[in-house]
Interface confidence: low
């Protein structure tokens, strides 16, 4: 036996308090598949969240936030403070990287300058708050002939520029 | 903040009739399903039938259906449910509780304080 | 009309300790269940709907379970203020039909 709720399109739920009939989603309300038994309530983009797209009977609300907070999670579930580049968000709000770390976006934690030694390279360019390091050739690289990249000038392992 | 406030108390003779009345109050009336319970001394909860303000709608468990009778008055948001030809058997508490539109994720979140109706000679 | 039982009709319990009722429907019910409290002279009051979704400002020692025939309801850890009768619902189908109460008090 076909199941009557099979028959209601997206936009629409199968209404078991009027007989099985298809009804239509009511305002603020979804439905995006057919033969839905309930519409579900449109996402509301409030307080820092604010509307990219406009829910319809046939799709949900979709959001993202407001200037100074970036979007966390599936289908943006969550909004975090932005932080500078060079810091990250702790607890107590936004904190300057640590020595020897650096982070190059608004969002995300302080990472690690890169270990150029482990590669065998040398540090081409200090490492920052804001950059890594930049790994230069490997100092077996830099033998008499080998090539023509001036020699960088004597750095510290790992790279650091003054705060 | 959402109420639903039933009538008082009634005492009834065999035979008669009773209009109970159950106002809301906190929402929107219309968007809601009221729906009314019966529960007997000592007993569980029995479902007797739903009404939809918005354009009067019923269901009813056949078992209520030649005894009750759901109306509403969108005007003073009231819902109500008359029971006929009252025998002792009616005796019972009756609540309204209220679900909301999609029957399928229905949740009886309020409720009102429920009438006792006593059928007595 | 889809008959529940519930199980077992009373049970006595010590504080803390895990509490658990069974409803059982006459068919298949999907998820389409809730469970319901209610304290002498009050009216009831929803705990859980669709078999296992806690309604909001419901305490987290309270949970439910299963679909198709068999539910259950699982309080963790008892306290003074969950004694009260129990009932499950089904809304699968109308009328929807509550299960016969499991009146839960303190050992």
């Known amino acids: 036996l076909q199941d009557p709720c099979s028959n209601c399109p997206a936009g629409t739920f199968c209404d078991n308090n009027r007989n099985q009939i298809c009804s239509p989603c009511p305002p603020n309300s979804f439905s995006s598949a057919g033969g839905q038994r309930t519409c579900d309530i449109c996402r509301q983009c409030k307080g820092v969240f604010r509307t990219r797209k406009e829910c319809s009977s046939t799709s949900n609300a979709e959001c993202d936030c407001t200037p100074g907070f970036h979007c966390l999670g599936a289908g943006c579930s969550m909004c975090e403070q932005d932080c500078k580049q060079g810091q990250e968000l702790t607890k107590k709000g936004c904190k300057d990287c640590c020595f020897g770390t650096f982070n190059d976006q608004k969002r995300g934690i302080c990472r690690p300058w890169t270990n150029c030694s482990l590669d065998g390279k040398s540090v081409l360019v200090n490492g920052t708050k804001e950059r890594d390091v930049v790994c230069g050739p490997s100092p077996a690289d830099l033998s008499p002939g080998a090539s023509s990249v001036t020699p960088p000038a004597p750095a510290r392992e790992p790279g650091h520029s003054p705060q | 903040q959402v109420q639903l406030v039933q009538s008082g108390a009634e005492v009834k003779k065999p035979g008669s009739s009773v209009k109970l009345s159950c106002k809301a109050s906190?929402?929107?009336?219309?968007?809601?399903?009221i729906n009314w319970v019966k529960q007997a001394p000592g007993q569980g909860l029995e479902w007797i039938g739903n009404?939809?303000?918005?354009?009067?709608?019923?269901n009813y468990n056949q078992k209520f259906k030649d005894k009750a009778t759901l109306t509403v008055d969108k005007s003073t948001s009231t819902a109500y449910m008359e029971l006929s030809s009252l025998r002792s058997e009616d005796t019972a508490v009756y609540y309204c509780t209220r679900t909301w539109e999609f029957y399928y994720d229905s949740v009886f979140d309020y409720w009102g304080q429920g009438t006792t109706l006593t059928v007595s000679s | 009309d889809i008959q529940m039982t519930q199980s077992p009709s009373s049970l006595s319990a010590s504080l803390g300790e895990r509490v658990t009722i069974t409803c059982k429907a006459s068919q298949d019910i999907n998820s389409y269940l809730s469970w319901y409290q209610q304290k002498p002279g009050k009216a009831p009051k929803t705990l859980i709907y669709?078999?296992?979704r806690l309604v909001d400002g419901v305490p987290s020692r309270f949970s439910g379970s299963g679909s198709g025939q068999d539910f259950t309801l699982t309080i963790s850890s008892l306290q003074p203020e969950d004694i009260a009768t129990y009932y499950c619902l089904q809304y699968d189908e109308l009328p929807p039909t509550f299960g016969g109460g499991t009146k839960v008090e303190i050992k």
């Open positions: 906190g929402y929107t009336f219309s968007s809601y399903w």
């Open positions: 009404i939809y303000p918005s354009d009067s709608y019923t």
């Open positions: 669709r078999a296992n």
